[in-house]
Amino acid sequence: LVPHLGDREKRDSVCPQGKYIHPQNNSICCTKCHKGTYLYNDCPGPGQDTDCRECESGSFTASENHLRHCLSCSKCRKEMGQVEISSCTVDRDTVCGCRKNQYRHYWSENLFQCFNCSLCLNGTVHLSCQEKQNTVCTCHAGFFLRENECVSCSNCKKSLECTKLCLPQIENVKGTEDSGTT
């Protein structure tokens, strides 16, 4: 089975690599524009130059192309705690990241939020914090993991998942309460 190609891919595949088919004359292959530039005018004929112009400030193209407009530079989202790692250039989009001791959580493919790495208080670090993953903590006895923090078993209610981890403590508390009644 031949995979379905979009119109643009079909047109491009007729020409050698680095060239594209002229939109008005499919017998002409024009040279693509270099990264950092965009297509201003198609080449007038075979072997003639494509008119490519440099992207204006605030826009970029990161690969060879025949785009009629450069792409708008991304902005780092302050409300998500993002900081600029490197600014936008004509051939590279803005790179956004997180501060030291923070990790990225991706809510969707193109949206991340920065959160502080867990310190594993009342526990030990099982896996260190990474760029896209929080610290993995192992809690000390008498503590259970809730929202990646080690919480005292005294805060464990019977209906919660923590009952398995805190069972001895819960039994002790129950036993202490029972022994006080006469």
Partner: nanobody
């Protein structure tokens, strides 16, 4: 106590429009980034849109870009989602929420309003 109450959901035909509202109380609304998320039956939560406190430069998921508009009225403590050109795949329960701060979970979100897109 933080309270978020959504309204405006309902049954609408494909191509139709709805405007969701979220009435907020129990916190300083004007200081918080607000979020719309949705959950279709049997699926996980999907981030739809969010809007910073000043209302500038809202974010939209690719699936709703150009069709949905998020807005807020800080004087009324209310968040809105204008939904146009609705599609069957927009059918879900829509929740408004405060942007999480401590970690990747929602501490505060409403019970939701059901949007059904069907002919």
């Amino acid at each position: 106590e933080v309270q978020l109450l959504e309204s405006g959901g309902g049954l609408v035909q494909p191509g139709g429009s709805l405007r969701l509202s979220c009435a907020a109380s129990g916190f300083t609304f004007a200081h918080e980034t607000m979020v719309w998320v949705r959950q279709a039956a049997g699926k996980g939560l999907e981030w739809v849109s969010h809007i910073p406190p000043d209302g500038q430069d809202p974010f939209y998921a690719d699936s709703v870009k150009g069709r949905f508009t998020i807005s807020r009225d800080n004087s009324k403590n209310t968040l809105y989602l204008q939904m146009n050109s609705l599609r069957a795949e927009d059918t879900a329960v829509y929740h408004c929420a405060l942007l999480p701060k401590r970690g990747p979970w929602f501490d505060y979100w409403g019970q939701g309003t059901l949007v059904t897109v069907s002919s």
